[in-house]
């Protein structure tokens, strides 16, 4: 069957009908509905929202909507024994305590079950000691402290500012440095944009606002007690001592009012340079310990949170494909929030809801997509991507055989300046072509395409005539689909101007002030940016599910493979003598990339010419496209990270949010000059080049003529 036989509308009209049905007013209404009370993972409120979404998706017209539950490890503060940090004097008296909660925003004073700020999965403990300020607690920050400044963090409590990298990496780095506790805080330099008022009068972080978040280092494992397998009714669970990724030292987050009180007394070494200074009126001394007058005072943490196995619920909706029902295009985003979730995740969930409604409307008129579309409302994303990962673990055999694409749908906005897209190179052409067909919502670009405004505001660093598209990293629910299973994935949202706003994320991220009013008053009063994101996400799903030939261009992979090979080669060439000594050659990798390029070019030519009315040949060509991403998966995974299996991309070992190319080679080369056994270290570089070259060559051969 051609895809036209699956529908009573012509293909061109399909996409237009779908896009025209999406309404900003509906997204606004859904956002309001989803943000009136907290929906913390594992709570009754979030279970009730799951059932509501299930019911509404059924009403919208999906073929089936099921709840998929798992019992996973979550973390909560002790309701009767709150977490806080003290300054104590020489007698052990608490002379200053950090706040126990955020002052609630106007209109929310009487809302119950607002979880106080905490670092999820922190162990219990009451360490006390001297403070060391470690800037962002990045790998390079600890290098600066330990190697250049000769400051020892062992047995110290470190205080780090949020931003730049995933908080779990900060905690891991602090642990490796020997710290016995970590205090995380939001510095106004990173979370207070100049010229903007604090919430509720603007979108900036007030001094009492605090960023919640998990501090795990799961490396793609999902539930810490059941790595690799679903946390179902008959699961075998590890003991807590063997759990994956749990931090070993107490961690707690605070706002900048409280941080001021801790940092203003700091003594010891001066900050090494201006990049270590934030915007508080404090010296940003590194320590250790407090200055002269206060040198006998110490910092004490009081952490009493508990880890508990708790039931979570995903909502999985199905719209069966008419021609290829065994090919799945997935649109998924999470439902659980830290508090109200005004941006994260409900600005995304509201968009998914409207996309489902639009697809349902078309289905009720007799239309079906060519391929099956699965819609997912994931639970427990904030606790380590748990809902999506457990579901993918449970359904891995189906997904690896049938998964065409995964489109992520967390927060629709993190600003209102321009579009931001991260995706597999296979989707570059789809994204370009789609955005050329959509209208820009931006002021000054009336009547112009989204592609045009996006390119103007966010040009590609390689070529200013094209928009920037970034590598996928992690920190969101696409992780298991892309990094573990090798399913082509993408994400899109509206973002800030990174040139002028150098703060990390958006200021009110994961705070109590992330409300409906934040979005409606300050970010997107007309919901036009939400609508645009709905059109991009929905349009991608539509094309992936309905185009006769999958809208993947394998030539884009050839291009980026060469770019990444050039990059990793130039990193290695910083050590020319060692490369010579240990006979390190990249010839095999460059040869494999060249072969991939030639085969991809020939495949692309065949794709233009083959007989699309022959369903067997069509399916064969589409399968080669679908399985190309899968071909980059190494079943053995990356060293010490078995669930990161993609050889071309992985989350950076130094920042989970960022993507790294040729991660196996990159990590083998990282800080290689400091390795105690250079022969072994360069041997590992050679092994990783071998793995990468083999994988690229093997992937190329999947695109060759089959016989």
């Amino acid at each position: 069957k051609s895809s036209n036989e699956a529908t009573n509308i012509t293909p061109k009209h399909n996409m237009k009908a779908f896009l025209d049905e999406l309404k900003a007013e509906n997204i606004k209404k859904f956002l309001y509905n989803f943000t009136q009370i907290p929906h913390l993972a594992g709570t009754e409120q979030n279970f009730q929202l799951a059932k509501q979404i299930q019911s509404q998706w059924k009403e919208f017209g999906l073929d089936s909507v099921e709840l998929a539950h798992y019992d996973v490890l979550l973390s909560y503060p002790n309701k009767t024994h709150p977490n806080y940090i003290s300054i104590i004097n020489e007698d052990g008296n608490e002379i200053f305590n950090t706040s126990l909660f955020e002052p609630p925003p106007p209109g929310y004073e009487n809302v119950s079950d607002i979880v106080p700020p905490f670092s999820a999965f922190s162990p219990q403990g009451m360490p006390e000691g001297d403070l060391v300020y470690v800037n962002y607690a990045r790998t390079e920050d600890f290098f600066k402290l330990e190697r250049d400044m000769k400051i020892n963090c062992s047995g110290k409590i470190v205080i780090a500012r949020y931003g730049k990298v995933f908080r779990g990496n900060k905690v891991k780095n602090a642990q490796l440095a020997g710290a016995k506790g970590v205090i995380l805080y939001s510095d106004p330099a990173d979370y207070f944009a100049p010229g903007v008022k604090s919430y509720p009068d603007g979108w900036n972080l007030p001094g009492g606002g605090v960023q919640r978040g998990n501090i795990l280092n799961l490396n793609g494992a999902g539930d810490p007690l059941t790595p690799g397998y679903p946390a179902n009714e008959y699961a075998y669970r590890r003991g807590i001592a063997e759990a994956v990724g749990l931090p070993s030292i107490p961690v707690h987050p605070i706002g900048y009012y409280d941080a001021q009180k801790l940092l203003e007394k700091m003594g010891g070494s001066a900050p090494p340079d201006s990049s270590w200074r934030g915007s508080l009126k404090v010296p940003y001394n590194v320590g250790p310990g407090f200055t002269g007058n206060f040198s006998t005072q110490k910092v004490k943490m009081h952490i009493h949170s508990t880890n508990e196995v708790t039931r979570i619920y995903n909502v999985i909706g199905t719209l069966r494909g008419a021609v290829e029902p065994d090919r799945y295009v997935i649109l998924g985003g999470h439902r659980d929030s830290w508090v109200f979730g005004g941006i994260d995740p409900q600005s995304g969930a509201a968009v998914v809801h409207e996309i489902v409604r639009s697809f349902g409307t078309l289905k009720k008129e007799g239309w079906r997509p060519r391929r099956t579309i699965l819609f997912a409302s994931w639970d427990a994303e904030e606790f380590g991507l748990l809902g999506s990962t457990e579901w993918a673990e449970e359904n891995s055999r189906l997904l690896q055989e049938r998964g065409v694409a995964y489109i992520n749908a967390d927060s629709s906005i993190e600003g209102n300046y321009t579009l931001r897209v991260d995706c597999t190179p296979l989707m570059y052409s789809l994204v370009h072509n789609l955005t050329k067909e959509l209208k820009s919502p931006d002021e000054g670009f009336e009547g112009k395409s989204l592609y045009e405004s996006w390119t103007k505001k966010s040009p590609s660093p390689e070529f200013s005539g094209m928009p920037r598209i970034s590598k996928l990293g992690s920190g969101n629910d696409f992780e298991v689909f892309f990094q573990r299973l090798g399913i082509a994935s993408g994400r899109a949202r509206y973002t800030k101007n990174w040139e002028t706003n150098k703060f990390s994320g958006y200021p009110l991220y994961h705070s109590v002030y992330e409300t409906y009013e934040l979005v409606e008053k300050f970010y997107d009063p007309m919901f036009k940016y939400h609508l645009t994101v709905a059109q991009v996400r929905g349009g991608m799903v539509f094309e992936l599910a309905n185009s006769i030939v999958l809208p993947f261009d394998c030539r884009d992979y050839a291009v980026v493979l060469r770019k990444y090979a050039d990059k990793i080669y130039s990193i290695s060439m910083k050590h020319p003598q060692e490369m010579k000594t240990y006979s390190v050659s990249f010839d095999s990798l460059f040869s494999a990339v060249k072969n991939f390029t030639e085969i991809a070019s020939k495949f692309s030519e065949r794709l233009q010419d083959f007989d699309k009315s022959n369903p067997i040949v069509l399916r064969m060509m589409n399968d080669q496209l679908m399985f190309l991403e899968r071909a980059f998966i190494d079943p053995l995974g990356l060293p010490d990270r078995p669930f990161y299996r993609h050889v071309i991309y992985a989350p950076s070992s130094h920042n989970k949010y960022a993507g790294e190319s040729f991660p196996g080679i990159y990590d083998a080369l990282f800080d290689i000059e400091s390795k105690v056994d250079p022969s072994k270290a360069w041997g590992e570089v050679k092994r990783q080049i071998y793995v990468a070259a083999f994988t690229v060559q093997a992937a190329a051969e999947t695109l060759s003529e089959v016989a």
Epitope: E462, V559, S601
Partner: nanobody, 123 residues
Framework: EVQLVESGGGLVQAGGSLKLSCVAN????????MAWFRQAPGKEHEFVAA????????NNADSVKGRFTISRDNAKNRVYLQLNSLKPEDTAAYYC????????????????WGQGTQVTVSS
């Protein structure tokens, strides 16, 4: 990463000729296919011509066939575009690009780009 710098542009009368040159840094020049694109005011980038790394094979856009010739000198890390029988519609900024395959005619599929050199053809 490859840095590319174009030169040779200028003002020329219809029917005239120009030779554009593009120099690349780095020792791996011969491993890249090279191309020329052009962009007229208010228009998208248009593929002009490309050449394989060894210089053996070229690919020319229909609009310039028989008039423009691409060539390269790997010893000098240079690629050239000889423009003959110029027409006013050839007026554009001309960009040199390095990439992976000479058959690719979409700008997206080229890796490294120069800043461009302006060619203006007066009637």
């Amino acid at each position: 990463e490859v840095q590319l710098v174009e030169s040779g542009g200028g003002l020329v009368q219809a029917g005239g000729s120009l030779k554009l040159s593009c120099v690349a840094n780095g020792p791996t020049f011969s491993t890249y296919a090279m191309a020329w694109f052009r962009q007229a005011p208010g228009k998208e980038h248009e593929f002009v011509a490309a050449i394989t790394g060894d210089g053996d094979t070229t690919n020319n856009a229909d609009s310039v066939k028989g008039r423009f010739t691409i060539s390269r000198d790997n010893a000098k890390n240079r690629v050239y575009l000889q423009l003959n029988s110029l027409k006013p519609e050839d007026t554009a900024a001309y960009y040199c690009a390095a990439g992976v395959h000479h058959t690719y005619t979409i700008p997206r599929l080229w890796l490294y780009w120069g800043q461009g050199t302006q060619v203006t053809v007066s009637s």
